[in-house]
Amino acid sequence: ELCDDDPPEIPHATFKAMAYKEGTMLNCECKRGFRRIKSGSLYMLCTGNSSHSSWDNQCQCTSSATRNTTKQVTPQPEEQKERKTTEMQSPMQPVDQASLPGHCREPPPWENEATERIYHFVVGQMVYYQCVQGYRALHRGPAESVCKMTHGKTRWTQPQLICTGEMETSQFPGEEKPQASPEGRPESETSCLVTTTDFQIQTEMAATMETSIFTTEYQ
């Protein structure tokens, strides 16, 4: 089931998927002056079995200078809405990402790929947020969002990250910084679609994330 909307935006923050759930689609977009090859795929699809997931189809771009046709626009699969885009920079990923069952890792770039990637997320997808450079987390509650299905409709959970540019915030004295505990959240406020194993693995990944994995920014 595709998610109807884009993941929520957080002021002065970017989000990133660490891995993509099976069923996720990535549009085959080419940079200006290039187009998809004639018989090329419209999108890549994350598919797999119980032990291994990978991207089906390959995106291929060719120079459009050889054709004197009108400007070609990449069609979207019929009933799908456009997903959030991401600027392609370094597709560096944490090594443990591949071990997440039922998920694909970030697809490697293809030749003459567009500068932005358009993903079509599915229910159960999780994305992680981080404050942009020059801002810091005033409050770091759950800094992720999950696409979940409620009452037959999809919705992304609201991340509880507040990024501030103000460096002079006051902290009350004599208080140790507590550890936020994601496992303490009531069921009604988490997605029933994300298994404990998924959540723990992804939380551990999020906890060990280095800034470098956020180099592929979502606009």
């Epitope: 409050h139 509880q160 910084k177 959240r185 406020e189």
Partner: antibody, heavy 115, light 107 residues
Framework: QVQLVQSGAEVKKPGASLKISCKGS????????MHWVRQAPGQGLEWIGV????????IYAQKFQGRATMTVDTSTSTAYLELSSLRSEDTAVYYC????????WGQGTTVTVSS | DIQMTQSPSSLSASVGDRVTITCRAS??????LEWYQQKPGKAPKLLVY???TLAEGVPSRFSGSGSGTDFTLTISSLQPEDFGTYYC?????????FGQGTKLEIK
């Protein structure tokens, strides 16, 4: 279910200080920042500030800087707002509200400042 | 600070009417906008967040739209229980400011 329960009404004299509380239940307290908002009689809503229940960091609206102090006690899942040097213009209903989108609010604490 | 301006400041409408309240920000706030409903003597209640997402439990007759500086809250078919004052508020940056409110009365 999620609840924010605030302390009872207060009557104070000008120049005095005030401390009101907001106890959260039904969710993990440190997951959500806490905002304080006030509403003078017949007036609109005014944002006082926000505190991270996780770190204790706080940001105040300029108007309340130096006179308002927000704190939290994570052991009791309670947020506090202290307001010093009270004046009659501070007469208002004070609310706590949870999270980025203020999705749950306390019932309000009526504060009357009068000589 | 970002100023939020609501219009109208008050309006009277009949049950079944389509009602629209607008909110304008003094600068671009993307979609970082919430709408609240407040009834006399009660705390505000979240209706819409991130400009267009309906809060849980809010009837589908309420909808939000807009982005940048101009936003709209629409009640498609006014119900008697919809009376009260409606506020918009941004969460783009601190201080998070509210609109002055729109008082909605049922004719």
């Amino acid at each position: 279910q999620v609840q924010l329960v605030q302390s009872g009404a207060e009557v104070k004299k000008p120049g005095a200080s005030l401390k009101i509380s907001c106890k959260g239940s039904g969710y993990t307290f440190t997951d959500y920042a806490m905002h304080w908002v006030r509403q003078a009689p017949g007036q609109g809503l005014e944002w006082i500030g926000v505190i991270s229940t996780y770190s204790g960091d706080a940001i105040y609206a300029q108007k309340f800087q130096g006179r308002a102090t927000m704190t939290v006690d994570t052991s009791t899942s309670t947020a506090y707002l202290e307001l010093s040097s009270l004046r009659s213009e501070d007469t208002a209903v004070y609310y706590c509200a949870r999270g980025v989108t203020f999705d749950y609010w306390g019932q309000g604490t009526t504060v009357t400042v009068s000589s | 600070d970002i100023q939020m301006t609501q219009s109208p400041s008050s309006l009277s409408a009949s049950v079944g009417d389509r009602v629209t309240i607008t909110c304008r920000a003094s600068q671009d706030i993307s979609n970082y906008l919430e709408w609240y409903q407040q009834k006399p003597g009660k705390a505000p209640k979240l209706l819409v967040y991130n400009a267009k997402t309906l809060a849980e439990g809010v009837p589908s007759r309420f909808s939000g739209s807009g982005s940048g500086t101009d936003f709209t809250l629409t009640i498609s078919s006014l119900q008697p229980e919809d009376f009260g004052t409606y506020y918009c508020q941004h969460h783009y940056d601190t201080p998070y400011t509210f609109g002055q409110g729109t008082k909605l009365e049922i004719k």
